[in-house]
C-alpha cells in the first residue's frame, strides 16, 4: 500500500482537513472521494460544486482538502483513490462531534420547605456523543441519574437529581456541568435553592451585661427568630405563669425592672411562621442583692518591708451558678 | 481560429492496434488538458481519455483502462492516442477535444473526427 | 447504459420554448454541461457549469441544475436549433458521463 490517510476529529462548524498521500510519487492521479463517493477532487479540480471543499496543497505526493463549516452530515468515509495499476484505494472516516446546543436545569418547585424532597432535572440537547452531566451542591458533587435518548445520530441527555432539602441548603447553587469532547472549558448552569424552614429561636441578655440577675435589678432580653420566610408572630409567655405585672414587651424584646424573688421562672419567646413554630426558653432566677464590702484591713509590722493586704468579698452562697445554662432553644 | 485534426483511423481486424493523431492549432497546446471521447455510429457520446498540460498525469476510462494509452508531445503540438487489443465495440468516430481551461472541465473545441 | 437519463425526443414549433432534461443521483451537486451535435457534425459546447455560455452562443440557451434534475432551456426554437443534445457530468468518481442523449424536432 503505498496510499496514506489519517482519521479526522472535527467539531461541527469548524475546518476538517483531509490529506491523501502518496510514498512513492509516479504521477498517478490521485482523487478523493465523498461518503456517497462522489469526487471531491480530482487532482486539483473540484467537480463538486460544494465550495466548503478548498484545495490547500497538491502534488504528486499529497492531495491535501480543507472542509470549512463542518456539519453531522459531513461525517463518515473519505476515500483517496490512486490511479495506479491496480488502483489503491484508502479511506480516511471524519468523526463530528457536536456540542450540546442547549444546557436547561429544571427545579421540580420553585420553593421547598426543609426535609422535603425535590427533583431537579438536567436536559443536555442534541449533542454527538452524548453528554455527561455531572452535579454539584455548592462544592459538593452529587450522584444522579441519566437517560439517553437518540434522535438522528444526536444524543439528548437528561439527570435526574433527587435531593433532600435542609435549611442549610438555603441559597446555595444546584449545578449542572457538563463534560463533553467539543466542550472547552466549564460549560455549566445553575439554580439557587429556596428552602423555607421554620424559626430557629435564639434568647439574647442584653441587660445586665455581666449576666447576674439581682433583686432590684432591670432585666432585658432579646428574642432573635431567624426563619424562611421571616416569622411573622414572636411573643413572649411566662411558662406555667402569669406574665409579671412590670414586665413591658416591646416586639422581640421583654423588660423586667426591678427585679424580685417573685419574678423567678422560665420566660419562652415563641415565633411562627408558615412552616413551624419553634421557641426558646430562659431560666430567670434573681439573686439576692449584694452584701456591703467591709473596708479592706491593711497589717503592717516594722520588722519587715512587706505589705500584705487582705480582701474579703462576702457574696451570696449561690453566685457560682451563673455560669449555669440560663436558655434553652427548641 | 482553434483547429483540431484527427488522423489515423481505418479499418482493423479484433485484437489489433491503430494510433490515433490530433493535430492542434490556433492556441497555446501546451496550456490545455486534452481529451479523446468516441461515438458509435448511431449511439451518443463516450469520453474515453484525458491528459494533464504537460503530460504528467493521465486518465481512463474503465472500458478502455489498460489497452489505449494517451500520450501527447507539446513541440509538436499533437495529441495520441494508441489503441491495442481493439475489441468490435470499440468501433466509433474518435474526437479529440481541448479543455475549455476554466476551473472546470469542458470539451469547448471538438475535431471533425476519424472513424 | 448512462447514469445520465435524458428523454429521447422533444418536439418544439418554432418561437417557443423547448425544455430538455437531464436526470441523475444527486446531480444538483455536481457541474453539468450541454453540448449540441447536428447531423454529421462535432459536438458543440452550448452549456458549462450550470447556466454559463461560452461566447459566441446566443442568449436563448440557457440551463439550470438542482437535486436530480438539469434541464436546458432553449427559448424562442429556431430551425437551426434541431439537433442532438447531450448533457455531461461528472457521476459519482466517474468522469465525463454524458447524458443519452435527446433529438430536438423543430416542427
Known amino acids: 500500500q503505498n496510499l496514506f490517510t489519517k482519521d479526522v476529529t472535527v467539531i461541527e462548524g469548524e475546518v476538517a482537513t483531509i490529506s491523501c498521500q502518496v510514498n512513492k510519487s509516479d504521477d498517478s492521479v490521485i482523487q478523493l472521494l465523498n461518503p456517497n463517493r462522489q469526487t471531491i477532487y480530482f487532482r486539483d479540480f473540484r467537480p463538486l460544486k460544494d465550495s466548503r471543499f478548498q484545495l490547500l496543497n497538491f502534488s504528486s505526493s499529497e492531495l491535501k482538502v480543507s472542509l470549512t463549516n463542518v456539519s453531522i452530515s459531513d461525517e463518515g468515509r473519505y476515500f483517496c483513490q490512486l490511479y495506479t495499476d491496480p488502483p489503491q484505494e484508502s479511506y480516511t472516516t471524519i468523526t463530528v462531534l457536536v456540542p450540546p446546543r442547549n444546557l436547561m436545569i429544571d427545579i421540580q418547585k420553585d420553593t421547598a420547605v426543609e426535609g422535603e424532597e425535590i427533583e431537579v432535572n438536567c436536559t443536555a440537547m442534541a449533542s454527538k456523543p452524548a453528554t455527561t452531566i455531572r452535579w454539584f451542591k455548592g462544592n459538593t458533587e452529587l450522584k444522579g441519574k441519566s437517560e439517553v435518548e437518540e434522535w438522528s445520530d444526536m444524543y439528548t441527555v437528561t439527570s435526574q437529581l433527587m435531593l433532600k432539602v435542609h435549611k442549610e441548603d438555603d441559597g446555595v447553587p444546584v449545578i449542572c456541568q457538563v463534560e463533553h469532547p467539543a466542550v472547552t472549558g466549564n460549560l455549566q448552569t445553575q439554580r439557587y435553592l429556596e428552602v423555607q424552614y421554620k424559626p430557629q429561636v435564639h434568647i439574647q441578655m442584653t441587660y445586665p451585661l455581666q449576666g447576674l440577675t439581682r433583686e432590684g435589678d432591670a432585666l432585658e432580653l432579646t428574642c432573635e427568630a431567624i426563619g424562611k420566610p421571616q416569622p411573622v408572630m414572636v411573643t413572649w409567655v411566662r411558662v406555667d405563669d402569669e406574665m409579671p405585672q412590670h414586665a413591658v414587651l416591646s416586639g422581640p424584646n421583654l423588660f423586667i425592672n426591678n427585679l424580685n424573688k417573685t419574678d423567678n421562672g422560665t420566660y419562652r419567646c415563641e415565633a411562627s411562621n408558615i412552616v413551624g413554630k419553634a421557641h426558646s426558653d430562659y431560666m430567670l432566677y434573681v439573686y439576692d442583692p449584694p452584701t456591703t464590702i467591709p473596708p479592706p484591713t491593711t497589717t503592717t509590722t516594722t520588722t519587715t518591708t512587706t505589705t500584705t493586704t487582705i480582701l474579703t468579698i462576702i457574696t451570696d452562697s449561690r453566685a457560682g451558678e451563673e455560669g449555669s445554662i440560663r436558655a434553652v432553644d427548641h | 481560429e482553434v483547429q483540431l485534426l484527427e488522423s489515423g483511423g481505418g479499418l482493423v481486424q479484433p485484437g489489433g492496434s491503430l494510433r490515433l493523431s490530433c493535430a492542434a492549432s490556433?492556441?497555446?497546446?501546451?496550456?490545455?488538458?486534452m481529451n479523446w471521447v468516441r461515438q458509435a455510429p448511431g449511439k451518443g457520446l463516450e469520453w474515453v481519455s484525458g491528459i494533464g498540460s504537460s503530460g504528467d498525469w493521465t486518465f481512463y476510462a474503465d472500458s478502455v483502462k489498460g489497452r489505449f494509452t494517451i500520450s501527447r508531445d507539446n513541440s509538436k503540438n499533437t495529441l495520441y492516442l494508441q489503441m491495442n487489443s481493439l475489441r468490435a465495440e470499440d468501433t466509433a468516430v474518435y474526437y479529440c477535444?481541448?479543455?475549455?481551461?476554466?476551473?472546470?472541465?469542458?470539451?469547448?473545441?471538438w475535431g471533425q473526427g476519424t472513424l | 447504459q448512462s447514469a445520465l437519463t435524458q428523454p429521447p425526443s422533444v418536439s418544439v414549433s418554432p418561437g417557443q420554448t423547448a425544455r430538455i432534461t437531464c436526470s441523475g443521483d444527486?446531480?444538483?451537486?455536481?457541474?453539468v454541461s450541454w453540448y449540441q451535435q447536428k447531423p454529421g457534425q462535432s459536438p458543440v459546447l452550448v452549456i458549462f457549469e450550470d447556466n454559463k455560455r461560452p461566447s459566441g452562443i446566443p442568449e436563448r440557451f440557457s440551463g439550470s441544475n438542482s437535486g436530480n434534475t438539469a434541464t436546458l432551456t432553449v427559448s424562442g426554437t429556431r430551425a437551426m436549433d434541431e439537433a442532438d443534445y447531450y448533457c455531461?457530468?461528472?457521476?459519482?468518481?466517474?468522469?465525463?458521463?454524458f447524458g443519452t442523449g435527446t433529438k430536438v424536432t423543430v416542427l
Open positions: 444527486r446531480l444538483g451537486e455536481t457541474y
Open positions: 455531461q457530468a461528472w457521476v459519482g468518481s466517474t468522469p465525463f458521463v
Open positions: 477535444a481541448k479543455d475549455l481551461g476554466t476551473s472546470g472541465w469542458n470539451f469547448d473545441y
Open positions: 490556433g492556441f497555446t497546446f501546451s496550456s490545455y488538458k
